[in-house]
C-alpha cells in the first residue's frame, strides 16, 4: 500500500483520502498517473470511425468515414469532402478563386489557369472553377518572306523554311 498518489502510473487513478493506485475502469483512461479520476474514452460514431482505439493510458482517436474529412483539432467534426472547383483549407472547403481551378474530387488544391499567351497561343475555351483553360494552336502570322525555323523533336539542328 502506497502512502502517496505521486508514484501512480498512467492508466491508474488515486484518491488522496485513500492513496491506492487503482486501474482505470473499462472505457476510461488516464495519460497521467495520480489523478483522482480517469477520463471517459471518446466514442467514434456516426460520421466518425476509430483511427485508434482507447487504451487505459490513451484516449481513442477518430477519423471521418469515406467521403468526409476532419475539421478542427483532434478531428472534432466531419465535413463532406470538397467537390471539384474547391480546395480544403483550415476553415473547410473553399471555392476556387476566379482564375484558378481544381478538377479533383475530395483532394487537390486550386491551381492557376494556364496562361496561353506565354506560349504564343490563343484561348480556345475559357477556364472554369473545375477546368483549366484550353489553349488553341500557336498563333503564327504568315507574311511575305517570313522565315520559320523548324526544329525536329529531340534534335538540336534546324531546317529553314522560306515562305514566299
Amino acid at each position: 500500500v502506497q502512502n502517496s498518489c505521486d508514484n501512480c502510473q498512467p492508466g491508474t487513478f488515486c484518491r488522496k483520502y485513500n492513496p491506492v493506485c487503482k486501474s482505470c475502469p473499462p472505457s476510461t483512461f488516464s495519460s497521467i498517473g495520480g489523478q483522482p479520476n480517469c477520463n471517459i474514452c471518446r466514442v467514434c460514431a456516426g460520421y466518425f470511425r476509430f483511427k485508434k482505439f482507447c487504451s487505459s493510458t490513451h484516449n481513442a482517436e477518430c477519423e471521418c468515414i469515406e467521403g468526409f474529412h476532419c475539421l478542427g483539432p483532434q478531428c472534432t467534426r466531419c465535413e463532406k469532402d470538397c467537390r471539384p472547383g474547391q480546395e480544403l483549407t483550415k476553415q473547410g472547403c473553399k471555392t476556387c478563386s476566379l482564375g484558378t481551378f481544381n478538377d479533383q474530387n475530395g483532394t487537390g488544391v486550386c491551381r492557376p489557369w494556364t496562361n496561353c499567351s506565354l506560349d504564343g497561343r490563343s484561348v480556345l475555351k475559357t477556364g472554369t472553377t473545375e477546368k483549366d483553360v484550353v489553349c488553341g494552336p500557336p498563333v503564327v502570322s504568315f507574311s511575305p518572306s517570313t522565315t520559320i525555323s523548324v526544329t525536329p523533336e529531340g534534335g538540336p539542328g534546324g531546317h529553314s523554311l522560306q515562305v514566299l
Epitope: 472547383g85 476553415q91 473547410g92 473553399k94 471555392t95 478563386s97 476566379l98 484558378t100 472554369t128 472553377t129
Partner: antibody
Framework: DVQLVESGGGLVQPGRSLKLSCAAS????????MAWVRQAPTKGLEWVAS????????YYRDSVKGRFTVSRENAKSSLYLQMDSLRSEDTATYYC?????????????WGQGVMVTVSS | DIQMTQSPASLSASLEEIVTITCQAS??????LAWYHQKPGKSPQLLIY???SLADGVPSRFSGSSSGSQYSLKISRLQVEDIGIYYC?????????FGGGTKLELK
C-alpha cells in the same frame, strides 16, 4: 452582421481616374474572395473584377482590363477599385460584393452601391 | 463567354399566383448558378445558390431547379414584396455573367 460600404464615387471627365473603396465588417475579410459588379442606369448587372483572399489573383472583364485595378488591404478590411482612363460607358452604380466561401461562387452580400458618372 | 439568356424580359402577375422565370446557359455550368432579386433603388439580394439551395432568410415560396442547361426560379405564391427585377448569375466560367433580368410587376 455582414456590412459592405462603398465610397469614392462621383462625376469625372473621360480619360480621368477615380478610386472606389469598400469597407467591410461583420466577417473575417481575409478569408473571402471579393468582387466588383456594376449596373449602368436602367440596365442589368455586369461583373467587373474579382480578387482572391490574399490579393494575389485579380481577374477582370475584358473591357476594363489594363484600365482598372482591383486590390485589397486585409489589415483594414478594405477592397479597392482603381479606375483609370475612364470612358462614358463606365458610367454605372458600382457594387462591392462578397463571394461565398464554400458555395457555388455566388455573391452572397452586396454593398449599397456608389454612383460613378463619366461625362465631359 | 458563357451567355445567360433570361426570359421573359418582363411579366405581370397577380397576388398568390405562381411565377416562373428561366435562364438558358450557352454551355454547361453545372450547379454554378444563383438567382437575385433587386428592388427599385436597392442592391441585389441573393435568393438561390447552387441552382436549388435557398439562401438564409429567404422565404420558402422561392425555389430553384434545372433541366439540362435551362435553370428556373419559381415563386409559388406571389407577394407584394416580390416585385422588382430578378437576375440569374453563372459563376462557373470567366467572365461571370448575369442574365438580362426579368422585371416582375403586379397585375
Amino acid at each position: 452582421d455582414v456590412q459592405l460600404v462603398e465610397s469614392g464615387g462621383g462625376l469625372v471627365q473621360p480619360g480621368r481616374s477615380l478610386k472606389l473603396s469598400c469597407a467591410a465588417s461583420g466577417f473575417i475579410f481575409s478569408y473571402f474572395d471579393m468582387a466588383w459588379v456594376r449596373q449602368a442606369p436602367t440596365k442589368g448587372l455586369e461583373w467587373v473584377a474579382s480578387i482572391s483572399p490574399s490579393g494575389d489573383i485579380p481577374y477582370y472583364r475584358d473591357s476594363v482590363k489594363g484600365r482598372f485595378t482591383v486590390s485589397r488591404e486585409n489589415a483594414k478590411s478594405s477592397l479597392y477599385l482603381q479606375m483609370d482612363s475612364l470612358r462614358s460607358e463606365d458610367t454605372a452604380t458600382y457594387y462591392c460584393a462578397r463571394r461565398s466561401y464554400g458555395g457555388y461562387s455566388e455573391l452572397d452580400y452586396w454593398g449599397q452601391g456608389v454612383m460613378v458618372t463619366v461625362s465631359s | 463567354d458563357i451567355q445567360m439568356t433570361q426570359s421573359p424580359a418582363s411579366l405581370s402577375a397577380s397576388l398568390e399566383e405562381i411565377v416562373t422565370i428561366t435562364c438558358q446557359a450557352s454551355q454547361d455550368i453545372g450547379n454554378w448558378l444563383a438567382w437575385y432579386h433587386q428592388k427599385p433603388g436597392k442592391s441585389p439580394q441573393l435568393l438561390i445558390y447552387g441552382t436549388s439551395s435557398l439562401a438564409d432568410g429567404v422565404p420558402s415560396r422561392f425555389s430553384g431547379s434545372s433541366s439540362g442547361s435551362q435553370y428556373s426560379l419559381k415563386i409559388s405564391r406571389l407577394q407584394v414584396e416580390d416585385i422588382g427585377i430578378y437576375y440569374c448569375l453563372q459563376a462557373y466560367g470567366a467572365p461571370w455573367t448575369f442574365g438580362g433580368g426579368t422585371k416582375l410587376e403586379l397585375k
